[in-house]
């Protein structure tokens, strides 16, 4: 076994090329210079190495860079990235968006792996915030990325980055996440006119408070039922029948099909039945005529 550590005569690799696919593991270990490998990393992508051979190449890089690979090497890792562990990646300092894109491209089509999650975490922490270009890149590869962040992490998203968000990027966000994103979106889109503003803000409305919904109801926005059903129940409850009618416009007829589902169900329970009847939709379950409605929350506040 001892003599295997020396590179056989004439086998020393002068460049990283396909002749190396004929090398046994021990020959790769002995005959490939790690510094040469580091400078020609891009070539590894183009050579059909076996898994075992890739393990050897990774091991050589690990020995050369025990503190973590430099970005010049990371950018050209190609599918060797799939062999990296989260522990390896935590040692990296990735600052270039091009490097991030190159590695995400390698993982394209896969679920977000622990390696990718670690890479993104390192990158975003290095930048200090989730800027527009980064968010653009991440949501292009992982449409659900934004909704995988905690409300605390989302708080570091600057309002300017919201322009990069597409409706499908918010599909899996829960109300707590939308609570954080909505004020940022409102700020980002504040200078747009009514109809354009509504198109942009619509996906974020799951985080909107009652007063904003009331304001929207005065702008002939014709909100669709799918958006209405994603609104916060506590924000919908104080809306009057007239406000909901204005908010939904021609889509108001869709309330009938949703009358057993939140937030429509809970909203109906808070409305006077004679107000609901004015919609002509046959909505049932409102407060019967003649009943006095006490707002207990207001009473408590007064006492």
């Amino acid at each position: 076994e001892v003599e295997k550590t020396a590179c056989p005569s004439g086998k020393k690799a002068r460049e990283i090329d396909e002749s190396l696919i004929f090398y046994k593991k021990w020959e790769l270990e002995a005959c490939v210079d790690a510094a040469l490998l580091a400078t020609q990393m891009d070539r590894v992508n183009a050579i059909p190495f076996t898994y075992e051979q890739l393990d050897v190449l990774k091991h050589k890089l690990d020995e050369l860079y025990p503190q973590g690979y430099p970005e010049s090497v990371i950018q050209h890792l190609g599918y060797l990235f799939l062999k990296m562990s989260p522990e390896d990646i935590r040692k990296w300092n990735v600052t270039s968006l091009e490097t991030l894109k190159a590695l995400l491209e390698v993982n394209k089509g896969h679920e977000m792996s622990p390696q990718v999650a670690t890479l993104i975490d390192r990158f975003v922490k290095g930048r200090g915030q989730l800027d527009k270009d980064t968010l653009d890149t991440l949501t292009a590869f992982y449409p659900g990325y934004l909704c995988s962040l905690s409300p605390e992490e989302l708080s570091s998203v600057p309002p300017s980055s919201i322009w990069a968000v597409r409706p499908q990027d918010l599909d899996t966000c829960d109300p707590r996440q939308l609570d954080v994103l909505y004020p940022k979106a409102r700020l980002a889109f504040q200078n747009m006119n009514g109809s354009e503003y509504f198109v942009k803000i619509q996906s974020f409305l799951g985080g909107a408070p009652t007063e904003d919904l009331k304001a929207l109801s005065q702008q002939n926005v014709s909100m669709d039922l799918a958006t209405f059903m994603k609104l916060r129940t506590d924000a919908v409850l104080p809306l009057t029948v007239a406000e909901v009618q204005k908010l939904l416009g021609p889509h108001v007829e869709g309330l009938k099909a949703e009358e057993r589902h939140r937030p429509v169900r809970d909203w109906i329970l808070r409305q006077r039945q004679d107000d609901l009847d004015t919609l002509g939709l046959g909505l049932q379950g409102g407060i019967p005529n003649g009943y006095l409605v006490l707002d207990l929350s207001m009473q408590e506040a007064l006492s």
Partner: antibody, heavy 123, light 115 residues
Framework: QVQLEQSGLGLVKPSQTLSLTCAIS??????????WNWIRQSPSRGLEWLGR?????????DYAVSVKGRITINSDTSKNQFSLQLNSVTPEDTAVYYC?????????????WGQGTLVTVSS | QAVLTQPSSLSASPGASASLTCTLR?????????IYWYQQRPGSPPQILLT?????????GSGVPSRFSGSKDASANAGILLISGLQSEDEADYYC?????????FGGGTKVTVL
């Protein structure tokens, strides 16, 4: 002379598993200078590499991203053959499926191919 | 954008030369890739024609005539298959292939018609 003979069902129902086998003559599935591939071809997707298996002191597999999670390639040294299983098929998986040898002396080019099996996914 | 792009068809007269291109996606440098070329006739599997990396590093498939040759055009970031002295039996589909990021990738193929 190396030859590959394919066998397997040509009609599979949606959501079921597609299974094909490739019998090798003139070479061994555990050869350390070859890899054994599955490729498919359809009008919509053209030629598409699905994955490969190879033996280098133990068995390894590489799979295409497009089918990862649905595909398994196994080898059987006693019968000198390898097989493809593709789970949860849809009509999109309708294609002619080929097995092929990659020869390391051709830098793993696929130099020997099976005859092809038309697999139709339909209820 | 596809990794490898080939023109869908090409027509030429018998005896003429045909140059088939295989363009690599921007950002993937043709210089470091070995290009593999396959011929496929109707009803048959593809057959290896040749592999080409450079003039000093190329392989002709077993029994493949020297009329088939490979080259690269670095400025176009493309691999090229040249068929000289075109014959009627050369009418077929031609595919390029590379190993890229852990898997084999094929071009969409070029259908060659001999007029």
């Amino acid at each position: 002379q190396v030859q590959l003979e394919q066998s397997g069902l040509g009609l599979v129902k949606p959501s079921q598993t597609l299974s094909l086998t490739c019998a090798i003559s003139g070479d061994t599935v555990s050869s350390d200078s070859a890899a054994w591939n599955w490729i498919r071809q359809s009008p919509s997707r053209g030629l598409e590499w699905l994955g490969r298996t190879y033996y280098r002191s133990k068995w390894f597999n590489d799979y295409a991203v497009s089918v990862k999670g649905r595909i398994t390639i196994n080898s059987d040294t006693s019968k000198n053959q390898f097989s493809l299983q593709l789970n949860s098929v849809t009509p999109e998986d309708t294609a002619v499926y080929y097995c092929a040898r990659s020869n390391s002396y051709y830098y793993y080019a696929m130099d020997v191919w099976g005859q092809g099996t038309l697999v139709t996914v339909s209820s | 954008q596809a990794v490898l792009t080939q023109p869908s068809s090409l027509s030429a007269s018998p005896g003429a030369s045909a140059s088939l291109t295989c363009t690599l996606r921007s950002g993937i440098n043709v210089g470091i890739y070995r290009i593999y070329w396959y011929q496929q006739r109707p009803g048959s599997p593809p057959q290896i024609l040749l592999t080409y990396k450079s003039d000093s590093d190329k392989y002709q498939g077993s029994g493949v005539p020297s009329r088939f040759s490979g080259s690269k055009d670095a400025s176009a970031n493309a691999g090229i298959l040249l068929i000289s002295g075109l014959q009627s039996e050369d009418e077929a589909d031609y595919y390029c292939m590379i190993w890229h990021s852990g898997g084999w990738v094929f071009g969409g193929g070029t259908k060659v018609t001999v007029l």
